[in-house]
């Protein structure tokens, strides 16, 4: 192979100019002609100076994997995927996400200690004694010792999930 400069690529025993980002080689250079470069078609891209005969396929962000498109594909840059709302990343690929999972739902008797982010799941915590959370979505557990005003006495101690009325 010939020793080509950084902005050239080898063709047989010769060096041809690379095409710019967003273009691929339609025809290699000749003695009197430069490289003929052709723009990448929609849905394809090349992100660097290159000697490629075909542009690369843009990645698809699969909603079934909990993904959404955070940056659309352009002819010079691949699409970037992020997590759909209510999801966090479980497989990181460089600076973007390859797969996401839905946030955990706190069970009854638990409170949301920390809401989920794009990189972290929801953190749940059991309600302390004497408090309850009936649906697991509350950030604070509620005190469960107060009886309804038409009841004179407490019927039972209650649990962290439900209170007796």
């Amino acid at each position: 192979l010939p020793s080509c400069k950084e902005d050239e690529y080898p063709v047989g025993s010769e060096c041809c100019p690379k095409c710019g980002p967003g273009f691929h080689v339609r025809q290699a250079c000749g003695e009197q002609t430069g490289t003929v470069c052709e723009p990448c078609s929609p849905g394809t891209y090349i992100a660097h100076f290159n000697g490629l005969s075909k542009c690369l396929q843009c990645q698809m962000c699969d909603p079934a994997m909990g993904l959404r498109t955070s940056r659309n594909c352009s002819t010079t840059a691949n699409a970037l995927c992020g997590c759909s709302p209510g999801h966090f990343c479980i497989i990181q690929d460089g600076d973007h996400c390859a797969a996401c999972r839905a946030y955990a739902t706190s069970s009854p008797g638990q409170r949301v200690q920390k809401g989920g982010t794009e990189s972290q799941d929801t953190l749940c915590q059991n309600c302390p004694p004497g408090t309850f959370s009936s649906n697991g979505t509350l950030e604070e557990c509620q005190h469960g010792t107060k009886c309804s005003k038409w009841l004179v006495t407490e019927a039972g101690p209650g649990t962290s999930s439900f209170r007796w009325v």
């Epitope: 902005d7 980002p21 430069g34 940056r71």
Partner: antibody
Framework: QVQLKESGPGLVAPSQSLSITCTVS????????VNWVRQPPGKGLEWLGM???????DYNSALKSRLSISKDNSKSQVFLKMNSLQTDDTARYYC???????WGQGTLVTVSA | QIVLTQSPAIMSASPGEKVTMTCSAS?????MYWYQQKPGSSPRLLIY???NLASGVPVRFSGSGSGTSYSLTISRMEAEDAATYYC?????????FGSGTKLEIK
């Protein structure tokens, strides 16, 4: 041997136009893109624009309205024209092949009355 | 446009010391390019396509990174490496340079 050499006026009065020529040798302008980059004294590099082998141009959006890049393949020359110069356009102006494999030595342009 | 922030702005290193400087992009870029410039000289291409060494560049230089975070490393500092280093992205128009890192010898 690949070479690029810029030639410019040196001194330009405020509000006037600037024309710089980049003369290249050792490669054909039909194949390679040429960039224009400038550097104010003591400051960093600023990309101005580029003309590709096929004649297409791309510009720095902040300067696009004032810039024009063209070339003459047969004379191996690339031209930079910039309008309405102000004192903060004082800089060394460089031409470079594609992504900077080769650079000219630059030409210093001073904008002053 | 994509803003490239280089850090530190100025640093110094002793001969033989390992040096790392970073280039942070305001949004994701596909590749990074690094240039070296000495006072009174034109810039010189050091690294292309993030990690490829340009011809004639000593192997003590290396580049790495992806997305928004890139770095240039000199494995063992030499006196001749004292210069200003610039990163540049070619992923998105306009092609922008970083503000530069000035590397001094101790």
């Amino acid at each position: 041997q690949v070479q690029l050499k810029e030639s410019g006026p040196g001194l330009v009065a405020p509000s006037q136009s600037l024309s710089i020529t980049c003369t290249v040798s050792g490669f054909s302008l039909t194949g390679y893109g040429v960039n224009w980059v400038r550097q104010p004294p003591g400051k960093g590099l600023e990309w101005l624009g580029m003309i590709w082998g096929d004649g297409n141009t791309d510009y720095n959006s902040a300067l696009k309205s004032r810039l024009s890049i063209s070339k003459d393949n047969s004379k191996s020359q690339v031209f930079l024209k910039m309008n309405s110069l102000q004192t903060d356009d004082t800089a060394r102006y460089y031409c470079a092949r594609s992504y900077g494999s080769y650079w000219g030595q630059g030409t210093l342009v001073t904008v002053s009355a | 446009q994509i803003v490239l922030t280089q850090s530190p702005a100025i640093m110094s290193a002793s001969p033989g010391e390992k040096v790392t400087m970073t280039c942070s992009a305001s949004s994701s870029v596909s590749y990074m390019y690094w240039y070296q410039q000495k006072p009174g000289s034109s810039p010189r291409l050091l690294i292309y396509d993030t990690s490829n060494l340009a011809s004639g560049v000593p192997v003590r230089f290396s580049g790495s990174g992806s997305g928004t975070s890139y770095s240039l490393t000199i494995s063992r500092m030499e006196a001749e490496d004292a210069a200003t280093y610039y990163c540049q992205q070619w992923s998105s128009y306009p092609f922008t340079f970083g503000s530069g890192t000035k590397l001094e010898i101790k």
